[in-house]
């Protein structure tokens, strides 16, 4: 089936896009797959649907499950599935593999690390970046829009990078973190 895995941490915001894309004018209905119960669109709910987006503000472990989105055009209905898993926050610094986004490679000439999923959120700069849980400091590191740029990349720059930002929804702020590995390749 047309399905997409999404994951997040409890007490953080998680926004999921219906994997079945449609034209902006098409309506999208969201359901809990197990119960076929409709997900409300009212923003006062902690979990609510907003067009192609399903918003968990904030997410809870019990939100884990499969969600169905049905995109409706005047003549076609197309179904997608979002497989959502919400994990408990780790007490230690290690980010487990199941929370990692895809690995990116960089070199001396090209060292952009994109903050995963950030385009789904209503955030404002600056992004905070961490490597192996340490806040990145120094002139070699530049947070530029949704990227981290590392100047003069070295082998030691390889590791796990976490971006942290705030999602704003109707005046309320929610934290979001996302982690991915960075590897350094020789030119």
């Amino acid at each position: 089936k047309f399905s997409k895995q999404s994951w997040g941490l409890e007490n953080e915001a998680l926004i999921v896009r219906c994997p079945r894309q449609g034209k902006p004018s098409y309506t999208v209905d969201w359901y809990y797959s197990q119960t076929n119960k409709s997900i409300p669109t009212q923003e006062r709910n902690r979990v609510f649907a907003s067009g192609q987006l399903l918003k968990f503000l904030p997410a809870a472990v019990e939100d884990s499950g499969i969600y169905t989105c049905i995109v409706r055009s005047p003549t076609f209905n197309r179904t997608g599935y979002a497989n959502v898993t919400i994990y408990k926050k780790q007490s230690d610094c290690n980010v487990p593999d199941y929370l990692m986004y895809s690995t990116v490679s960089g070199s001396e000439k090209n060292s952009k690390i994109y903050c995963p999923t950030i385009d789904l959120y209503n955030w404002t700069a600056p992004l905070e970046w961490f490597k192996n849980c340490q806040a990145l400091q120094g002139s070699r590191y530049r947070a530029h829009k949704s990227f981290l740029v590392i100047d003069n990349v070295m082998t030691e720059d390889a590791g796990d990078y976490t971006c942290k930002f705030i999602h704003n929804e109707n005046g309320a702020n929610y934290s979001v973190t996302a982690t991915r590995s960075f590897t350094v390749k020789d030119e």
Epitope: K23, T75, F76, R78
Partner: antibody
Framework: EVQLLESGGGLVQPGGSLRLSCAAS????????MIWVRQAPGKGLEWVSS????????YYADSVKGRFTISRDNSKNTLYLQMNSLRAEDTAVYYC????????????????WGQGTLVTVSS | EIVLTQSPATLSLSPGERATLSCRAS??????LAWYQQKPGQAPRLLIY???NRATGIPARFSGSGSGTDFTLTISSLEPEDFAVYYC?????????FGQGTKVEIK
Amino acid sequence: EVQLLESGGGLVQPGGSLRLSCAASGFTFSIYDMIWVRQAPGKGLEWVSSIRGEGGGTYYADSVKGRFTISRDNSKNTLYLQMNSLRAEDTAVYYCARDPWSTEGSFFVLDYWGQGTLVTVSS
Amino acid sequence: EIVLTQSPATLSLSPGERATLSCRASQSVDDDLAWYQQKPGQAPRLLIYDASNRATGIPARFSGSGSGTDFTLTISSLEPEDFAVYYCQQYITAPLTFGQGTKVEIK
């Protein structure tokens, strides 16, 4: 009612050129991706080319790449296929069709088709 | 490109019988697969989209199933007007490709 009407087919010599037109009506032409599909006599269907709606991005089958050009005039609700360097194997009925859904980077089915126009390449 | 192989090439059946047509993809197309019906001298007509959804106005005797690489079009009880050629088409990626067709003929 959605209607697609092809024209411009005919007999042409190998190496020659032809321009097919498809006049669309009954829907907001500019927001839909449009497609050319052909069918050689007694054979199956072959996708030829697609063009995005307002963005105008184009896609071609390897068999026609570099020889055929798809275009559209949204102000005239018309789709075109300019066919150059025609070969005998291009002989087919050419259909224009509408993709009712697709978003950037994706494709969908063809829900409305024209009646087709016959292109014969022969000396 | 993704190759779609339809079987059988020809299906000889009587009105009222059940028709089962197969379409196999050379690689997974998820459920991005459609079925069309074409009668002589006519343009194809969309029957099924997203592997199992009937297009508007298509009778309930037509049903589609499958996902990934193996798909089936079933006509539960053939009507005289159902004798035609049927094509599957994938639209997960360009180039869009069609199967070679299955002809359903009167026995």
